[in-house]
């Protein structure tokens, strides 16, 4: 029989009472197959991180510097519910740290460096960790001690709780620096004022303060954010332009064998019995012997975290960088305007090879990181183990999702002024061959279909979110009787038709036979009856274009368009029989990565785009015989964006709005965790 | 198709030097770019440095200053000079001309440098 027993872990001896009732009553609504509470009772928070590490206990809430210390080897601890506070319609687990200026003041996050500072409190989250952890590699050596440092870096501050002995400029703007509400600038609400009376030029706060200062919207506008990229945006643009989102108060467990779905049928049949006015007997969010005990007293509920979601990911990149800096306290040598190199997210081995070749021939330039699926490498460049990758339009939508943006786009067109100039989009189509003439668009149910991926636009998004409109319903396994969408799951039918060997059967890269617009057109080729490809597929693997065994001898005449009415096309009139056009891939990073990403490529793309002429004997960055790696091989340009640099802009409303309602049908697990985030 | 044949690994105590030659059986001359990977035991393959047809150079950060590659297009050899070894460059080290672009699965049988007291 599996042990149902939850060990929470207490670190006061209030908190072991309230566990030890919160056990009684539990016991006393729960069948006894169900999830049950035991108490361990430990001295401290780091002493309860090191007892779930360690198996003697499984479960305990934590505020997010210590979900950072769980996260840390050897702890290894993961998120797996959230505390919600608001309401359950609109429920916020997360906080955003942000800067606040007055609207005329003109100077940008880059720009801190002798100005006036307000804080909430030293050694608070967003009123000092997150800021000075932001701050730290600009503050002048040596950094420690910190305060220090941060008393030289700004012209005079109010840091409420700093010694105003040893630092008296943390205390200029309040004289005392006094640690209570009796310091008129202490914590948010006196952090804000210190910013409305004039005595500093920027505050340190979280994004609910200025409403729960400033009512009248009027007010609300003399104010701005200042944002990492060293914009401005107003107040409630928070989920922008932020220093970074915090989370409230997170239960953690172990990463591995660490009950998460136990942890979450307690929790979740705990706040169905005694959630907020639920039990006037037993209240979770209540600490009638103390303040927080267990659970925050502020909560209104739980959220069960996704489990795609590390802690890495739930606390987010500017949170632990601002962390891992004050911890760590190391920086590059000295701060210089010049780029690092580009670290490029490379899928699988193939994918890898390339990757080293571009970074041997750009001298530094270019490092590589690998991982095995498409989403792995967009949680890597999320969380700065990687900075960068070129995706199709779906996961553009995804990274997009995730907080990534759009840097470049690929063109696919020769023209005179390709760089300046990004193209509408490529077609989707549905290609089968000739020979099956019967074949049209109503009749594909029953048949063999060969997909890019699950996920990418022209082998997914867009078939299947015209088939979901028919349909309506997402079971695509049981409406084809069986296929290759490389990313589904193994026991699918639409794994049935892959040809990769072992483990690599149905992965969504290169080492899968059948992935991509080449794979998914072998797999019409060798197997299937409709492949969902882009309009150069075709072409571009016949005619002896492709000369691999499988491709040599095709020729294009043998196979047709499937078009939306019925009817059918040859291959040549793509613009005339499509499913949907489709946005062309995009190269994106991180926000903070943005300019030096643009740059860097540019520069890539001058030495080893098309301008060369011999491949065989020079690198070349957008060709790989017709296997797409890194970028598509029919590649021209890396093409600027303009004013379409975020991913609606770039995937315009049309396709967005495609996606979001295939979203009921997405088996993304990083989408989900993304907006779980962002919901 | 080029075949590459590296040589030159040893046992060889820390502090020590190793030169690994890779030879091919065909010109490299046209070879764009040249470069060794290297396996330790349980680990994945690794880039250790890099060489293009015009000499440019690139190390991993881990080889940086003891390691060198060069490349020497008349006898059709490229070399990887060790210095300094460390216990954690041991390792099966091979030698690949990327001039299959990037698809193949083939490599040489590679040589094991070994580097212990």
């Known amino acids: 029989v599996p042990d149902k027993t939850v060990r929470w872990c207490a670190v006061s001896e209030h908190e072991a009472t309230k566990c030890q009732s919160f056990r009684d009553h539990m016991k006393s609504v729960i069948p006894s197959d169900g999830p049950s509470v035991a108490c361990v009772k430990k001295a401290s928070y780091l002493d309860c991180i090191r007892a779930i590490a360690a198996n003697e206990a499984d479960a305990v809430t934590l505020d997010a510097g210590l979900v950072y210390d769980a996260y840390l080897a050897p702890n290894n601890l993961k998120p797996v519910v959230a505390e919600f506070y608001g309401s359950k319609e609109d429920p916020q687990t997360f906080y955003y740290a942000v800067a606040v200026v007055k609207k005329d003041s003109g100077f940008q996050m880059n720009q801190l460096r002798g100005k006036k500072s307000c804080h909430t409190g030293l050694g608070r989250s967003a009123g000092w960790n997150i800021p000075i952890g932001l701050l730290y590699c600009d503050l002048p050596e040596p950094r420690k001690p910190l305060e220090k440092a941060v008393a030289n870096f700004f012209s005079g501050s109010c840091a409420p709780c700093a010694d105003g002995t040893d630092f008296p400029q943390l205390c200029q703007l309040c004289p005392g620096c006094g640690c209570s509400t009796l310091n008129q600038y202490f914590g948010y609400s006196g952090a804000f004022k210190c910013l409305k009376d004039g005595a500093g030029d920027v505050a340190f706060v979280k994004h609910s303060t200025i409403f729960e200062n400033l009512a009248n919207k009027a007010d609300r506008d003399q104010y701005e954010l200042l944002c990492l990229d060293n914009t401005r945006k107003p107040v409630d643009e928070y989920k922008d332009c932020h220093l970074a989102q915090v989370p409230s108060h997170t239960v953690v467990a172990r990463s591995m064998g660490g009950k998460e779905d136990l942890i979450w049928e307690l929790l979740n049949q705990a706040q169905e019995h005694f959630g907020k006015d639920k039990s006037k007997e037993f209240q979770l969010f209540s600490s009638p012997h103390g303040k927080d005990l267990l659970f925050k007293d502020s909560a209104h509920g739980f959220l069960k975290v996704p489990p795609r979601m590390d802690a890495k990911m739930y606390l987010g990149y500017e949170y632990v960088t601002a962390i891992r800096n004050l911890r760590e306290g190391t920086c590059p040598e000295a701060p210089t305007d010049e780029c690092k190199p580009v670290k490029w997210c490379a899928l699988s081995h193939h994918e890898r090879l390339k990757c080293d070749e571009w970074s041997v021939n750009s001298v530094g330039k270019i490092e590589c990181v690998s991982a095995e699926t498409t989403e792995d490498c967009i949680a890597k460049i999320m969380n700065g183990e990687a900075d960068a990758m070129s995706l199709d339009g779906g996961f553009v939508y995804i990274a997009g999702k995730c907080g990534l943006v759009p840097v470049l786009a690929e063109n696919y067109n020769k023209s005179d002024n390709c760089e300046d100039t990004p193209e509408a989009g490529y077609f989707a189509i549905a290609v089968v061959k000739k020979s099956a003439s019967d074949l049209t668009w109503d009749n594909l149910k029953g048949k063999k279909s060969c997909h890019t991926a699950v996920g990418r636009t022209a082998g997914w998004n867009i078939p299947m979110g015209l088939l979901y409109n028919k349909i309506n319903h997402c079971r695509f396994d049981e409406f084809f009787s069986e296929g290759c969408a490389p990313g589904s799951k193994k026991d699918s039918s639409l794994c049935k038709l892959c040809m990769g060997s072992g483990l690599n059967l149905c992965e969504p890269n290169n080492k899968e036979g059948y992935y991509g617009y080449t794979g998914a057109f072998r797999c019409l080729v060798e197997k299937g009856d409709v492949a969902f490809v882009k309009h150069q597929t075709v072409p571009q693997n016949t005619g002896g274009k492709n000369p691999d065994p499988w491709a040599k001898n095709l020729n294009e005449k043998d196979y047709e368009l499937l078009c939306l009415d019925g009817t059918r096309k040859p291959v040549e009139e793509y613009a005339n029989c499509h499913l949907a056009r489709a946005p062309n891939h995009a190269v994106v990073t991180r926000k903070d990565k943005e300019a030096c990403v643009h740059k860097i490529l540019r520069q890539q793309q001058h030495l080893f785009g098309s301008n060369v002429t011999d491949c065989s004997g020079n690198f070349c960055l957008f060709r790989s015989e017709t296997k797409d790696l890194l970028f598509r091989d029919d590649t021209v340009c890396l093409a600027k964006l303009h004013d379409r640099n975020t991913y609606e802009k770039y995937l315009g409303e049309e396709y967005v709005k495609a996606v979001g309602n295939l979203r009921k049908c997405s088996t993304s697990s990083l989408l989900e965790a993304c907006t779980f985030r962002r919901p | 198709e080029v075949q590459l044949v590296e040589s030159g690994g040893g046992l060889v105590q820390p502090g020590g030097s190793l030169r690994l030659s890779c030879a091919a059986s065909?010109?490299?001359?046209?070879?764009?770019?040249m470069a060794w990977y290297r396996q330790a035991p349980g680990k994945g393959l690794e880039l250790v440095s890099g060489?293009?047809?015009?000499?440019?150079?690139n190390y991993r950060d881990s080889v940086k200053g003891r390691f060198t590659i060069s490349r020497d297009n008349s006898k059709n050899t490229m070399y990887l000079q060790m210095n300094s070894l460390r216990a954690e460059d041991t390792a099966v080290y091979y030698c690949?001309?990327?001039?299959?672009?990037?698809?193949?699965?083939?490599w040489g049988q590679g040589t094991l440098v070994t580097v212990s007291s």
């Open positions: 065909g010109s490299i001359f046209s070879i764009a770019t």
């Open positions: 060489i293009t047809r015009s000499g440019s150079t």
């Open positions: 690949t001309d990327y001039s299959s672009r990037y698809y193949h699965d083939y």
